[in-house]
């Protein structure tokens, strides 16, 4: 379990029930860095501190998850708690402008391809799906598969549909997807590679 995750959990568990409710509401409208999706409202509002910590880490990874949590705490006027959280994650204040992310600290699973290791983060964070489809069309994806992914209404659902075809892929097919990701969203791949 990462240090940042523990620090997020510690901060959220120290909120009163009313503060936790307020935290969730603010999380729905706090500006996010480019490339990050928002936790769906329905799922968010029913979560306890532990579930919310897990969701923050899966959606935003540990480092940005901690930074985002601190920003929401600031926006609640809980600056001391925000400071403690950032001190616990060794980030300091004002370190990086929006759009720059320090290496996340979550551990990757060994033996799996990058694509499989980071499935959840890719579903949540890939925004340029059409570009990926064009890169994979005719090499990895059939016309039917290509159209099926394109038909999905949102980027996360497009990515989920794309991942539904990956069990049949070999390592080389997955490498092609990784290469396409490197070309379309290099910052995202770099983030995940450092995790």
């Amino acid at each position: 379990m990462g240090r940042a995750r523990d620090a997020i959990l510690d901060a959220l568990e120290n909120l009163t029930a009313e503060e936790l409710k307020k935290f969730k509401l603010k999380l729905l409208s706090v500006p996010l860095r480019e490339g990050y999706g928002r936790i769906p409202r329905g799922a968010l509002l029913s979560m306890d501190a532990l579930d919310l910590t897990d969701k923050l880490v899966s959606f935003y990874l540990e480092t940005y998850g901690a930074e985002l949590t601190a920003n929401v705490l600031r926006d609640m006027g809980l600056q001391e708690m925000a400071g403690q959280l950032q001190a616990a994650t060794h980030q300091g204040s004002g370190a990086a402008p929006a759009g720059i992310q320090a290496p996340p600290q979550s551990a990757a699973k060994p033996g799996l391809h990058f694509i499989d290791q980071h499935r959840a983060a890719l579903i949540a964070r890939v925004t340029n799906v059409e570009w990926l489809l064009d890169a994979l069309y005719g090499k990895v994806l059939t016309d039917e598969q290509y159209q099926a992914v394109r038909a999905e209404p949102t980027n996360p659902s497009k990515m989920r549909k794309l991942f539904s075809f990956t069990p049949a892929w070999n390592w080389t097919c997955k490498d092609l997807l990784l290469q396409a990701l490197r070309e379309s969203q290099s910052y995202l791949v770099e983030d995940l590679e450092r995790s």
Partner: antibody
């Protein structure tokens, strides 16, 4: 009442840095984000960055990362924006605004009157 | 960056009319949109936040609506003091971005 006071105008030579000030009153300065916004004549609004006065944490627009530095002085409840090596492109009105922590929405409920910066030799 | 497109730079209206200002986001921003009014020589003034909530003190002739990518600001029974420029702003993602503005003019 809540106010953000800004000097009306600053004339600056090209390349000579300038520091714009924004004095807050009527609320707890350290609890609400201060945001800076640029408006060139006849053009739209551009977000430069936010600063949280309590701990000086900043979020900045990458476009302005080498152009503007945001700081605060808590003792005088004043926010500052340091414009670095200004050129004619930086001639604009610069507003400081407040994001009230009472609201969840990230909109700006109070605006200063703006400082008109003219970069000219 | 998320681009906020206000396709109409100018709109002509008469006192008492109903007018609709539109704003389109380049990607889904949920309801994380605000509207501002800027009169000539003044700073922007907040009208609407969270797409449809009026800021305190804003007359109820101003109504915001929309979600996802399409947003509207409707002014019913336009008054002479409403002749100004209107900007939309998204705060779903950094960098925060504004529309280019729509100027309301008398016919």
């Amino acid at each position: 009442q809540v106010q953000l006071q800004q000097p009306g105008a600053e004339l600056v030579r090209p390349g000579a840095s300038v520091i714009l000030s924004c004095k807050a009153s009527g609320y707890t300065f350290t609890s609400s984000w201060i945001t800076w916004v640029k408006q060139r004549p006849g053009q739209g609004l551009e977000w430069i960055g936010n600063i949280y006065p309590s701990d000086s944490y900043t979020n900045s627009n990458q476009k302005f990362k080498d152009k503007a530095t945001l700081t605060v002085d808590k003792s005088s409840s004043t926010a500052y924006m340091h414009l670095i090596s200004p050129t004619s492109e930086d001639s604009a009105v610069y507003y400081c605004t407040r994001k009230d922590f009472v609201y969840d929405a990230w909109y700006f409920d109070v605006w200063g009157a703006g400082t008109t910066v003219t970069v000219s030799s | 960056d998320i681009v906020m497109t206000q396709s109409q730079k100018f709109m002509s209206t008469s006192v008492g009319d109903r007018v609709t200002v539109t704003c389109k986001a380049s990607q889904n921003v949920g309801t994380n949109v605000a509207w501002y009014q800027q009169r000539p020589g003044q700073s922007p003034k907040p009208l609407i936040y969270s797409a449809s909530y009026r800021n305190s003190g804003v007359p109820d002739r101003f109504t915001g609506s929309g979600s996802g990518t399409d947003f509207t600001l409707t002014i019913t029974n336009v008054q002479s003091e409403d002749l100004a420029e209107y900007f939309c702003q998204q705060y779903n993602n950094y960098p925060l971005t504004f529309g280019a503005g729509t100027k309301l003019e008398l016919k």
